[in-house]
């Protein structure tokens, strides 16, 4: 028949070519002479000339070694004619397949590999994966199947198999306990590619597995006892700076320190941070520290890390013994803001106060007095005692000086410290009101027609406060009462002035005297400008001139 | 000569607690990871639970996980197993062993849990 | 149901050989040489007769000797004793949080 079996041909054939494969036979050759000829890629297309037929005898033939990497299979077509160039069969299909021959090492896909495992992990833990190809067959045969093998590991530390890799996938594992990234940061491991499942070409590449930090090191004090000197009252003051060991990984979570004050500060005095770049603890005062009330404080300090440890590790505490230095402080004012009531207008030399100022410091020290600012300058103030005495009239209603019935004075002190301190203290002179003023009445200046007049409706005021203000009363003195009325309204705040009698024009005075409910009397003179007009008017109207 | 010795076993009813000890010598303990693996009575070896040297890294088998603490006290030489929520099925002999390289070296005698009402 | 496979007994006569199997996967047995095996007398703590397939401990008898293929490792016992009755188990390294796998153990009978 017409047909052929698929032929195997190893790759790498070492000759003599042309080399017979098979021989293509028509039964028609019993009546007629055939020639033969073969098509397709490896015959008369690319790669052409690999084979070729005998054209008489049908003989294939394979013309040089081939290359199952290359192509792996060959697909042709036979063909059969007389000689008169007539096909005598159908084209035939002839398959030519390429067998493999282990004739490819594998080759890694990188020369290096690059992993990272946690220290401290358990064995079976996953670390990278390794690959290496092979392009010879691994389907049909072992030729292309890979083993992969751990050849060695660098540094042998804690011991020489710390490792192992998955024979089939190439993936690393760790083996054994003891990564300590402290002791070990890197391993460098030759592995090993293996064809035929691990018996036959090798090759190697290297593996660094890189040791990845854990917080598995507490931060640990270096000095653990310091002593150190602080003056009283600094605030934000730098204390001391601690000093710390971390064998982690530097400027990690689990090297930088957190630093707690554990106890020692009762009155919540000090504070510590880290410095970013030292990794030390500043130690600084948050307040101003009293040398009088306690000259020591003995501090205790634990460290730990900004990453939580991931075993149970001991805290390093540090003693710090902070002396408290002494220092000239001033004297302060008690209370620092004095609030006096004293009534206004008493007596030159009269007494007002007594204000004084104790000293911080232990020692004894002799405190004098004097006034800082009297904007009136009506108070002294003895330097020895503090007594402050009247100098001048307290006037409530001096607007200038006085607000809100306030009159405010700021004293000094100062201690025979070497070098002096002064404090400053504020004495407010609340100032108890006495009726010394009478009522005024405004406006002081009327004008009113003298015929059909309108009343005139003045206000009252006092400087004073109640009760020495309203209600008040009006009397008309001097004869002013032959032509005018003055009464006081119900309220009693306002004054109604009333012409009477007829008067020509002509500008009078108005004699009225106004007394308080303390019958405090204040005389005013009203000058009243009398127009020849009726009812209401502002300003007389100027004599008539005819045109 | 290496050295383990459980103790902590006992009867215990279903839903209570036990924790188990395990004191080493002999050996670097800090460099050894261990491991609590149990035998049901007449049944074959089941392993529990691992911890690394450190104390850093643990394992647990699902049949626990959630009710059974691993942890390890490097400065007393000593492995603990925190069993909580004891069912009648944990009912075994434990035993601690430090694990090597690719297995279990050295072992403990055992001790017996007994989870019954 | 274990992760290694052993035979439930074996039984041989003394001074005659025996083998026990321990059928795991490509991704234990078959993928690191790292089998070992237990002998565990009746009320006593298993001990290490095996380790890295083929590798003895100090002090275990070289009558004890492993091999592997594939996805199979075998311990082999030679010149059978009346000691060596006991359970044994085969013992599989594997990547991951389960990185020991047991064998369900074999009880050896010295007939």
């Known amino acids: 028949d017409w047909v052929v079996a698929p032929i195997s041909v190893p790759e790498n054939g070492k000759g003599p070519f042309p080399q017979r494969l098979n021989q293509l036979k028509s039964n028609k050759d019993r009546d007629t002479k055939i020639f033969y000829s073969i098509t397709g890629p490896g015959a008369d297309s690319p790669p052409e000339g690999v084979f070729a037929v005998e054209k008489e005898t049908g003989w294939l033939l394979l013309n040089k070694p081939l290359d199952r990497e290359e192509i792996a299979k060959y697909e042709l077509f036979g063909h059969a004619v007389s000689e008169n160039g007539a096909s005598v069969e159908d084209p035939m299909n002839i398959s030519i397949i390429v067998t493999d021959q282990n004739d490819h090492k594998p080759k890694f896909t990188q020369d290096t590999f690059r992993g990272s495992v946690l220290e401290g992990v358990l064995p079976g833990t996953s670390v990278m994966q390794v690959t290496a190809t092979d392009e010879d067959d691994a389907i049909y045969t072992y030729n292309g199947v890979v083993a992969y093998s751990i050849h060695s590991q660098e540094p042998k530390d804690p011991h020489d198999l710390m490792f192992t890799i998955h024979r089939s996938t190439g993936t690393i594992s760790v083996i054994s306990s003891g990564l300590d990234r402290e002791k070990v940061p890197e391993y460098t491991l030759t592995i090993q590619a293996t064809d035929m499942d691990g018996d036959g070409s090798t090759t190697t590449a290297v593996a660094v597995v890189e040791i990845l930090d854990a917080n598995d090191n507490a931060p640990m004090f270096d000095p653990q006892k310091y002593e150190a000197h602080v003056p009283e009252n600094a605030v934000g003051h730098e204390v001391q700076r601690l000093t710390v060991t971390d064998l982690d990984a530097p400027n990690s979570p689990a090297w930088r320190a957190t630093y707690l004050i554990m106890g020692g500060d009762d009155g919540d005095h000090f504070t510590i941070t880290t410095h970013p770049e030292s990794n030390q603890g500043i130690l600084t005062t948050r307040k101003g520290l009293d040398f009088e009330a306690k000259n020591q404080h003995t501090l205790y300090v634990e460290v730990t890390n900004e990453a939580p440890f991931v075993l149970k590790l001991p805290t390093s505490t540090a003693t710090i013994v902070v002396h408290v230095e002494d220092v000239n402080e001033a004297p302060v004012f008690v209370p620092p803001s004095k609030v006096v009531e004293v009534q206004e207008g008493i007596p030159t030399g009269e007494p007002v106060c007594v204000y004084t100022a104790e000293d911080p410091d232990k020692e004894n020290q002799k405190i004098s007095y004097r006034i800082l600012r009297d904007p009136a300058g009506w108070l002294a103030m003895d330097p020895d005692s503090g007594q402050v005495t009247a100098v001048g009239t307290l006037d409530r209603e001096d607007e200038q000086f006085v607000r809100n019935n306030i009159y405010e004075v700021m004293v000094l002190a100062m201690d025979n410290g070497s070098p002096p301190t002064t404090g400053t203290g504020t004495l407010l002179l609340t100032l108890i009101d006495v009726n010394d003023h009478g009522p005024v009445p405004e406006p002081r200046q009327i004008t009113i027609c003298n015929q059909s007049p309108v009343r005139q409706v003045l206000n009252i005021t006092d400087k004073d406060l109640s009760p020495h203000t309203s209600p008040f009363q009006a009397q008309l003195t001097d004869d002013s009462d032959i032509y005018w009325t003055a009464e006081v309204n119900e309220e009693g705040d306002t004054v109604v002035l009333s012409l009477k009698k007829f008067l020509k024009q002509d500008t009078y005075d108005v004699h009225l005297s106004l007394s308080d409910h303390g019958n405090k009397e204040q005389l005013t003179v009203i000058r009243a400008t009398v127009c020849d007009c009726h009812g209401h008017v502002e300003t007389c109207p100027g004599p008539w001139k005819g045109g | 000569e290496v050295q383990l010795l459980e103790s902590g076993g006992g009867l215990v009813q279903p839903g209570g607690s036990l924790r188990l000890s395990c004191a080493a010598s002999?050996?670097?303990?800090?460099?050894?990871?261990m491991s609590w693996v149990r035998q049901a009575p007449g049944k074959g070896l089941e392993w529990v639970s691992a911890?690394?040297?450190?104390?850093?890294?643990?394992y647990y088998a699902d049949s626990v996980k959630g009710r059974f603490t691993i942890s390890r006290d490097n400065s007393k030489n000593t492995l603990y197993l925190q069993m909580n929520s004891l069912r009648a099925e944990d009912t075994a002999v434990y035993y601690c062993?430090?694990?090597?390289?690719?297995?279990?070296?050295?072992w403990g005698q055992g001790t017996m849990v007994t989870v019954s009402s | 149901q274990s992760a290694l496979t052993q035979p439930a007994s074996v039984s041989g006569s003394p001074g005659q050989s025996i083998t026990i199997s321990c059928t795991g996967t490509?991704?234990?047995?078959?993928?690191?040489?790292?089998v070992s095996w237990y002998q565990q007398h009746p009320g006593k703590a298993p001990k290490l007769i095996l380790s890295?397939?083929?590798k003895r401990p100090s002090g275990v008898s070289n009558r004890f000797s492993g091999s592997k293929s594939g996805n199979t490792a075998s311990l082999s016992i030679s010149g059978l004793q009346a000691e060596d009755e006991a359970d044994y188990y085969c013992?599989?390294?594997?990547?991951?949080?389960?990185?020991?796998?047991f064998g369900g153990g074999t009880k050896l009978t010295v007939l």
């Open positions: 062993a430090s694990w090597g390289t690719g297995q279990h070296e050295n």
């Open positions: 002999g050996f670097t303990f800090s460099s050894y990871a």
């Open positions: 013992s599989s390294f594997t990547s991951g949080s389960t990185f020991n796998l």
């Open positions: 490509s991704n234990d047995v078959g993928a690191y040489n790292y």
């Open positions: 890295e397939v083929n």
């Open positions: 911890i690394s040297g450190s104390g850093g890294s643990t």
